[in-house]
């Protein structure tokens, strides 16, 4: 449903996708019960949500992961929501950290991030994690989205 | 405050209720500092939020639970946000998982779920957990809600 | 971007600030990539978000903390989102609890709170924690905000 031609609803919700890439940037797909309201928000290269209109957006991500203290580095598992704006430095908007579980073979934990941010036209948001191989891709466990206020 | 007669605000926030039922579906109540904007969203049978209008909704749930690794099954505690639409399969929208704590008698943990989804008229959302007896019902610990964009 | 003069967007996102105060109320600042849409929401005394207009608000907070079971009290780490309205008792809107980690020197964990609530003109919301000295203030780890529906 539209707010009006000049002010259409803009929202997205995308679903995690396992990836063979070694990058720490999570991959997403328009699959399952995804949302993509219109072409004013797009999923680019399966890794970032890019908006065409300036404004305030509530941006969120949820990451479920399975890790074990002995098998992982000393550092905790960190998920970061990051922003890339044309002609600007990338920046971290939100981060969450969870220490690895002692459960074997691994212990599942879920992280939720969310906040209100001003985005410029052409701005992209993406999600970084310390170890993508630990992320859980079962139905509903890991997702990423935004909505324009 | 209304957006206008044709486009009223639609929002709900309900509070967890302990239940003697053996079902894995959590029970909710309009009590304490709850929100129910109007009759375009209703709490049905104390277990599901049902919407009358099609559109994009941000739906969220928070579940706090107290569990112990030795006293619980091997499987983690999982909270699921699920959707029921007339004439459609039920489906999992979001899930979060937390491995049980080693703290005694039990260790508290909190899970937060949230995302943007298209709902059809008559659609209902509800929250499932692996063990309802572990859920914490103290003020503010466990709640469930939505808002229409 | 405004919805119109009579119905401007109201939103805020503030960033955690380390404090030498012994109070359990977290301190916030308009720094980094913060949001403060207009003077209809303000950050007062670095500790509370105060709104001028009545209405439904989605309010959220994220707190990352680092604690150790042996070095902490038996009680879990609890984060509370609280409401102060003119002429009313303070009340808890949302709470989340996480048992302390056994990791040394401390184990990081993140909590996310969020929900829809009716606020009166002059109402303030703030965040309380059991031990502010355990809160992580690195970029993006701990933040607090709201948006008016």
């Amino acid at each position: 449903m539209q707010k009006g031609d000049q002010n259409p609803q803009i929202a997205a919700h995308v679903i995690s996708e396992a990836s063979s890439k070694t990058t720490s940037v999570l991959q997403w797909a328009e699959k399952g019960y995804y949302t993509m309201s219109n072409n004013l928000v797009t999923l680019e290269n399966g890794k970032q949500l890019t908006v065409k209109r300036q404004g305030l957006y509530y941006i969120y991500a949820q990451v479920t992961f399975c890790s074990n203290r002995e098998a992982s580095s000393q550092a905790p598992f960190i998920a970061s929501l990051c922003l890339k704006s044309p002609g600007r430095f990338e920046r971290i908007l939100l981060r969450a950290a969870n220490t690895h579980s002692s459960a074997k073979p691994c212990g599942q934990q879920s992280i939720h991030l969310g906040g209100v941010f001003e985005l410029q036209p052409g701005a992209s948001v993406f999600v970084n994690v310390t170890d993508p191989s630990q992320v859980s891709h079962g139905t509903g466990f890991t997702s990423f989205g935004l909505l324009k206020l | 405050m209304q957006k206008g007669d044709q486009n009223p605000q639609i929002a709900a926030h309900v509070i967890s209720e302990a239940s003697s039922k053996t079902t894995s579906v959590l029970q909710w109540a309009e009590k304490g500092y709850y929100t129910m904007s109007n009759n375009l969203v209703t709490l049905e049978n104390g277990k599901q939020l049902t919407v009358k209008r099609q559109g994009l909704y941000y739906i969220y749930a928070q579940v706090t639970f107290c569990s112990n690794r030795e006293a619980s099954s091997q499987a983690p505690f999982i909270a699921s946000l699920c959707l029921k639409s007339p004439g459609r399969f039920e489906r999992i929208l979001l899930r979060a998982a937390n491995t049980h704590s080693s703290a005694k008698p039990c260790g508290q943990q909190s899970i937060h779920l949230g995302g943007v989804f298209e709902l059809q008229p008559g659609a209902s959302v509800f929250v499932n957990v692996t063990d309802p007896s572990q859920v914490s019902h103290g003020t503010g610990f466990t709640s469930f809600g939505l808002l229409k964009l | 971007m405004q919805k119109g003069d009579q119905n401007p967007q109201i939103a805020a996102h503030v960033i955690s600030e380390a404090s030498s105060k012994t109070t359990s109320v977290l301190q916030w600042a308009e720094k980094g990539y913060y949001t403060m849409s207009n003077n209809l929401v303000t950050l007062e005394n670095g500790k509370q978000l105060t709104v001028k207009r009545q209405g439904l608000y989605y309010i959220y907070a994220q707190v990352t903390f680092c604690s150790n079971r042996e070095a902490s009290s038996q009680a879990p780490f609890i984060a509370s989102l609280c409401l102060k309205s003119p002429g009313r008792f303070e009340r808890i809107l949302l709470r989340a609890a996480n048992t302390h980690s056994s990791a040394k020197p401390c184990g990081q964990q993140s909590i996310h709170l969020g929900g829809v609530f009716e606020l009166q003109p002059g109402a303030s919301v703030f965040v309380n924690v059991t031990d502010p000295s355990q809160v992580s203030h690195g970029t993006g780890f701990t933040s607090f905000g709201l948006l008016k529906l």
Epitope: Y33, Y34, M36, T139 | F117, E118, Q120 | -
Partner: nanobody, 123 residues
Framework: EVQLVESGGGLVQPGGSLRLSCAAS????????MGWFRQAPGKEREFVAV????????LYADSVKGRFTISADNSKNTAYLQMNSLKPEDTAVYYC????????????????WGQGTLVTVSS
Amino acid sequence: EVQLVESGGGLVQPGGSLRLSCAASGSGLSINAMGWFRQAPGKEREFVAVIYSSDGSTLYADSVKGRFTISADNSKNTAYLQMNSLKPEDTAVYYCAAEPYGSGSSLISEYDWGQGTLVTVSS
């Protein structure tokens, strides 16, 4: 389009068991979920159970939880519904349905349906 063929219905006494099968066929088979609905005489069609192909997640209607189990053999493109502790109120025509891939939340895709198989629970 996917063709669905159900089998396994019949007459059974209260407390008894039945196993329904649903075989899917068709070119370029691409199924997101398979499941079962049922329709009792004079009533609306209602959801019974579903299994999602991505990770085998299952969901059940409250009325059948703990009694019915849905499973799938992806190599045979077949879904099964094991029905135990059957009750007279389980009497209905059971329809298999399949949801194609690529149906986002704003795009309510049409299901493919089987012809239905009758289950009668009576002494």
